[in-house]
Each structure stands twice: as structure tokens, then as C-alpha cells.
Amino acid sequence: AQHVTTQLVLRNKGVYESVKYIQQENFWIGPSSIDLIHLGAKFSPCIRKDQQIEQLVLRERDLERDSGCCVQNDHSGCIQTQRKDCSETLATFVKWQDDTGPPMDKSDLGQKRTSGAVCHQDPRTCEEPASSGAHIWPDDITKWPICTEQAKSNRTGFLHMDCQIKGRPCCISTKGSCEITTREYCEFMHGYFHEEATLCSQVHCLDKVCGLLPFLNPEVPDQFYRLWLS
């Protein structure tokens, strides 16, 4: 059986939309499937790599690599999107291309970044971990770390940094899929909202879905002990 909830929820474009949340009900009137997984149920994607989930994550990453920061022209906010999802009239799509990106490092101004921009994250403004020396962030936003400390400046002069961020990674469903969403939408969908991250590639949704002990390698499920737990 399914339990359907409908509610008006704030979405990425800053408007309220009617959203449906469909929950598979437990036939035996007990915990939900997500709770059962958290409690240690035999859920194979938590025990070993699941090809379907792996393909989903790779597809999400490929899309994210090509994303940019969509900044609303009315200063109402910004969100990481694909160019096609960013209004040409109501917003500005900030994407580094044609030599407009910042240099990879101050030692070589000529080598410019082509991957980005990312809403609220920039190698020029992140102090920790700083993109410098042997630890220069790659020219691939899906390999960027989470910035834990921004430069102490209320304004950077960068459109994608000075805007009010409207969406962050949200882990939805038992398949460990990730979407950049508003906190309201994420909570309504019973997802896990990552306040600390800016990109889906920075979070490991399956690790969150599975719970219990974190995977040794966040990309590789290793909870073999589930076989004895349930």
C-alpha cells in the first residue's frame, strides 16, 4: 500500500508548488523501509556495490560537472543548475568558459578554470581547505572538497558568491539519489539536507541511507555485518 501526502512546498525557483510524497507503507504496520535500513535490515546496496545505484551516481555527477550558478536578477537568490533550467530573461547563468574562469593558481595565471562556477563556493575565497601549493582544487567541480572556512569578507564582488543560496544537496529515497533542493522540499520528501555542502558530489547519500557504521570508503558499501544483524 502507498501513503500519499500533498503539500505546497517552496521549490528552487522561489515559488511554492504542490508536491506529492509517496511513501511505501509497511504491510505489517511497522517501521518504514528507510527506518528498517537504518536499523540494519539486509539491504544489498549497503552491503556491496549496486550497479544501478552506481550508474545513477555517475549520471548525476556528469550532469553536475556541466552545471553553473543560476543567479536571479531580482537578487532573490541563486541555485546550482543546468543552463537549460536557468531562465535567460529572469536570471544570469554564471559558468566559466572562453577564458573567463579564474586561474588555477596564482603562480600560473595563464591556466584558467573551465569547470564552475559553483554557488557559494570558489577556490579564490575558500581559506580551508585552501586551493594552493600541492592542494590545488582540480578543474572539475565534482572533485572539489567542502569549504569549511570562507574568507572573512561580506562581499566578494562575485555574482555566484554574493547571492543568497536557495538550494543545497538533499539525499532522497533508499536509492541514495541526490538533488539540489530547498530545505523545505528536502524535509517534506523526508530527505537528508546537507547544509555544509554546495554540490551533490560532495555528499555520499548511500552512506546516509544505510546509517550504522560509516563506510570505510564513502563510495564503497561495506556493511557485511548486516547479514548477522537481522
Epitope: D98, D99, T100, G101, P103, K106, S107, D108, L109, G110, K112, R124, T125, E127, A130, S132, A151, K152, T156, G157, F158
Partner: antibody, heavy 120, light 107 residues
Framework: QVTLRESGPALVKPTQTLTLTCTFS??????????VGWIRQPPGKALEWLAH???????YYNPALKSRLTISKDTSKNQVVLTITNMDPVDTATYYC????????????WGQGTLVTVSS | EIVMTQSPDFQSVTPKEKVTITCRAS??????LHWYQQKPDASPKLLIK???QSISGVPSRFSGSGSGTDFTLTINSLEAEDAATYFC?????????FGQGTKLEIK
């Protein structure tokens, strides 16, 4: 507010070494993404970038003058010092110190400049 | 090094006129170009960064455009206080280099 002030001799003899000091306030040279450097302008001519020193001690010099230039900083005193060896009359110019940022590698604040004449 | 060439070297204009100053780079520099204003006996002041981005406190009559090798600084409705020399600067690669300057005289 941010201010920078250059100081040093107004007159130096050929072959001598010039030492210029930039004293700044309103920011710290230990602040991420900031640097202070030197630009000169011969009378009636264009600006020429000489050198910069960054918050993390990185130093960059104009290759055409690199062998003659040394830049250093004293963060506690809010000072940056530039030395130019083997001065020549063609080095006669107004020397400016300016703040630079890795945000765009442009100079957002400048000192008022100090005119240095090289003559025997 | 990248050579920056400005034109014209000198321009005499009347107040309220629209002025355009061009800057050409010896190679493509994307949008890594900044404009400065230097009034007589004063130090330079940053006007425009990244070819077209305005700087807070700079009058809106100043605007910039261009990318690649050709750039333009436009002053809409010139005012007497705009008499100055204008320089462009590239930050595409070390060493940072400037144009030779365009001197603007108000008639």
C-alpha cells in the same frame, strides 16, 4: 579605511641601491587573498608593474627586472619593502605601492606615490 | 609578455559627450582586463574589473565591455571631473602589464 603610503629617498645616485617602504593600514597582510606590491611610472609614461608579495609569503617579480628586485614584508609593522639594486637614470619614476587581490589580480587601493630621481 | 595598446593616446572632448577608449591585447585574455583612472598629480583608481564589472563608488556613467583581445571603456555624458588619463591592465598572465594610457582633456 584602507590607506597606503610610500617612503624612501627622493634622489639616488647611479649604481646605488634604492630601498622603498610601503606602510599601510586598514587591512592586514596576513589576510587570505591579499597582497601588496609596487608599480612605477616614469614621468609622462605608462605604468609598469614591478613586484608583489602575498599573504602566504609568495613573491612575484617582473622578469625584465627580477635580478635587481627584492620584496619583503613585515606583517607586524604593516610594511612592505622593495629594494632595487644598480639604479640607473632610466629608473627615474614615481613609485607606487598598491594592494592586490587574488579575486581578480587588479590593484584596488594605491598609495599617493613617491618620486625617485636617479642622477649623479 | 602581453602587450596592451590603447587608442587614442589623446582625446579632447566637451562635457556631456559620450567617450569611448579602446584597449587591444596582443593575445586573447578572456575578460581578465581592468580599467584605471589617474587624475593629474594623483594615484590611479580602479574603475572597472573583469572587463565589465563595476566597482562600488564609481559613477554609473563609466562602463566597460569586450572580451578576447578588444576592450572598450565608455564614459556616458562626460563631466569636467573626468579629465584624467585612463589605463587598461591585463591580469591574464604574469607579468601584469598596462596600456600606455589615454589622456582625456575637457574642452
Amino acid at each position: 579605511q584602507v590607506t597606503l603610503r610610500e617612503s624612501g629617498p627622493a634622489l639616488v645616485k647611479p649604481t646605488q641601491t634604492l630601498t622603498l617602504t610601503c606602510t599601510f593600514s586598514g587591512f592586514s597582510l596576513s589576510t587570505f587573498a591579499l597582497g601588496v606590491g609596487w608599480i612605477r611610472q616614469p614621468p609622462g609614461k605608462a605604468l609598469e608593474w614591478l613586484a608583489h608579495i602575498w599573504w602566504d609569503e609568495d613573491k612575484y617579480y617582473n622578469p625584465a627586472l627580477k635580478s635587481r628586485l627584492t620584496i619583503s614584508k613585515d606583517t607586524s609593522k604593516n610594511q612592505v619593502v622593495l629594494t632595487i639594486t644598480n639604479m640607473d637614470p632610466v629608473d627615474t619614476a614615481t613609485y607606487y605601492c598598491a594592494r592586490i587581490t587574488t579575486y581578480y589580480y587588479g590593484m584596488d587601493y594605491w598609495g599617493q606615490g613617491t618620486l625617485v630621481t636617479v642622477s649623479s | 609578455e602581453i602587450v596592451m595598446t590603447q587608442s587614442p593616446d589623446f582625446q579632447s572632448v566637451t562635457p556631456k559627450e559620450k567617450v569611448t577608449i579602446t584597449c587591444r591585447a596582443s593575445q586573447s585574455i578572456g575578460n581578465h582586463l581592468h580599467w584605471y583612472q589617474q587624475k593629474p598629480d594623483a594615484s590611479p583608481k580602479l574603475l572597472i574589473k573583469y572587463a565589465s564589472q563595476s566597482i562600488s563608488g564609481v559613477p554609473s556613467r563609466f562602463s566597460g565591455s569586450g572580451s578576447g583581445t578588444d576592450f572598450t571603456l565608455t564614459i556616458n555624458s562626460l563631466e569636467a571631473e573626468d579629465a584624467a588619463t585612463y589605463f587598461c591592465q591585463q591580469s591574464y598572465q604574469w607579468p601584469l602589464t598596462f596600456g600606455q594610457g589615454t589622456k582625456l582633456e575637457i574642452k
